[in-house]
């Protein structure tokens, strides 16, 4: 019961997370014009991964797509790639996890197959979440760098007579959506991996009970039947899951490289 709940919850959390990653990727507000300590303008600039927009105070909004691939900064391309990889992995993970759900019966699918699929989807969710977190963090780092650079030369004068105020950009709503969504996908993935361990058929650790039949001393070990019905590779499976858990931990230690914002 707990395993089913953990798996179901993991699926729902990942689903919300991936929806959030998709939303963040499509959002235009990755970076927004910094209004603090800036002259009040009649226009408000904000930028996304795919286009930049300007909203005039009248409410008129004009967006222009980045109709070039080669002319875009490498960092922006990298962020796009990370977000897309995150979405693709997440979508595949969702597809796999639907079939892995314990509450859904598909033909005569065995528990070991469901356990494997749960683990696979869990790892996919973890990588998907990490991709989103990494993508958003790279973009945030890029913003911080540009912000301080533009602050350093905010007023570039022509002989000190004419001033040009540079537009500074700060974190947009999409960054926070992306961080939260990536985190949720990651948590969902971890939950799936935990659920997978419970789904895996294990040898029952009952003490052997001796039944004394006429003249024969036969030790009957519950679970012996299982071993003869194709679940004999149980110990092997356990090793794979343990390995998976270790891999998951290794992957989890990775985002610290990106935690500089």
């Amino acid at each position: 019961m707990a395993v089913t709940a953990c798996q179901g919850l993991g699926f729902v959390v990942s689903l919300i997370g991936i929806a959030g990653i998709i939303a963040a990727t499509c959002m235009d507000q990755w970076s927004t014009q910094d209004l603090y300590n800036n002259p009040v303008t009649a226009v408000f600039n904000y930028q996304g991964l795919w286009r930049s927009c300007v909203r005039e105070s009248s409410g008129f909004t004009e967006c222009r797509g980045y109709f070039t691939l080669l002319g875009l900064p490498a960092m922006l391309q990298a962020v796009r790639a990370l977000m897309i990889v995150g979405i693709v992995l997440g979508a595949i993970g969702l597809l796999v996890s639907i079939f892995a759900l314990k509450c859904i019966r598909i033909g005569s699918m065995e528990d070991s197959a469901k356990a494997n699929m749960t683990l696979t989807s869990g790892i996919m969710f973890i990588v998907s979440g990490l991709c989103a977190i990494a993508g958003v963090s790279v973009f945030a780092n890029m913003l911080v760098t540009n912000f301080w650079m533009s602050t350093a030369n905010m007023y570039t004068g022509m002989g000190g007579m004419v001033q040009t105020v540079q537009t500074r950009y700060t974190f947009g709503a999409a960054l926070f959506v992306g961080w939260v969504a990536g985190g949720l996908t990651l948590i969902g993935g971890v939950m799936m991996c935990i659920a997978c361990r419970g789904l895996a058929p294990e040898e029952t650790n009952y003490k052997a009970v001796s039944y004394h039949a006429s003249g024969h001393s036969v030790a009957y070990k519950p679970g012996g039947f299982k071993a003869s019905t194709g679940f004999g590779s149980n110990t092997k499976n356990k090793k794979i899951y343990d390995g998976g858990a270790r891999t998951e931990d290794e992957v989890q230690s990775y985002p610290s490289k990106h935690d500089y914002v």
Partner: antibody, heavy 118, light 113 residues
């Protein structure tokens, strides 16, 4: 077609408050755009006073900020200008206008002349 | 506040002549977000409200004759009338449409010789 018409007292005594009304026909003031008050002094100097947006928020010229208030009555499709503690410096022709929206043109009223005199 | 400086303050011209008037702002009116300059030109005839001629520094308002051309970027802007007609005699104002408070130039008065 969109039309704006200013109306006001014409003559106000110094230190009193001035209230002007801009009646809009042909377009709802809550549907969009910025609704401005602009004045022109006898020396032809144009001064933007402030505006009220379609959603009711304001932006004022800091030189008038503690004296000016722009409000609206959506049921009558009107917006108002209130200027406190007027002086002879406030003698001008007052225009109300609908601001430009992207490529869409702006519209102005014909203006109402206001004299501040004792 | 942004100071808009127009020159000359008045111009005396003959019909059919090409006219150029200047407008300078104390700060750049260029918005990098959409690569537009937020400068507007108005024409005002006696006893009438100002009429929008050009916005975004160079975009002609619909219905405005093509003899009116706006140009310039950043802080320096120009309004050119390729061939002045008698109906063009008016005062021309430039306006900062970027920074609040929105500010106008003192105007350039176009008069007939």
């Amino acid at each position: 077609d969109v039309q704006l018409q200013e109306s006001g007292p014409g003559l106000v005594k110094p230190s009193q408050s001035l209230s002007l009304t801009c009646s809009v026909t042909g377009y709802s003031i809550t549907s969009g755009y910025l609704w401005n008050w602009i004045r022109q002094s006898p020396g032809n100097k144009l001064e933007w006073m402030g505006h009220i947006t379609y959603d009711g928020s304001n932006n004022y010229n800091p030189s008038l900020k503690n004296r000016i208030s722009i409000t609206r009555d959506t049921s009558k499709n009107q917006f108002f200008l209130k200027l406190n503690s007027v002086t002879t410096e406030d003698t001008a022709t007052y225009f109300c206008s609908r601001g430009r929206y992207g490529n869409n043109r702006d519209y102005w009223g014909q203006g109402t002349t206001l004299t501040v005199s004792s | 506040d942004i100071v808009m400086t127009q020159s000359p303050s008045s111009l005396t011209v003959t019909s059919g002549e090409k006219v150029t008037m200047s407008c300078k702002s104390s700060q750049s009116l260029f918005n990098s977000g959409n690569q537009k300059n937020y400068l507007t030109w108005y024409q005002q005839k006696l006893g009438q409200p100002p009429k929008l001629l050009i916005f975004w520094a160079s975009t002609r308002e619909s219905g405005v004759p093509d003899r009116f051309t706006g140009s310039g970027s950043g802080t320096d802007f120009t309004l050119t009338i390729s061939s002045v007609q008698t109906e063009d005699l008016a005062v021309y104002y430039c306006q900062n449409d970027y920074y609040y408070p929105l500010t106008f130039g003192a105007g350039t008065k176009l008069e007939l010789k």
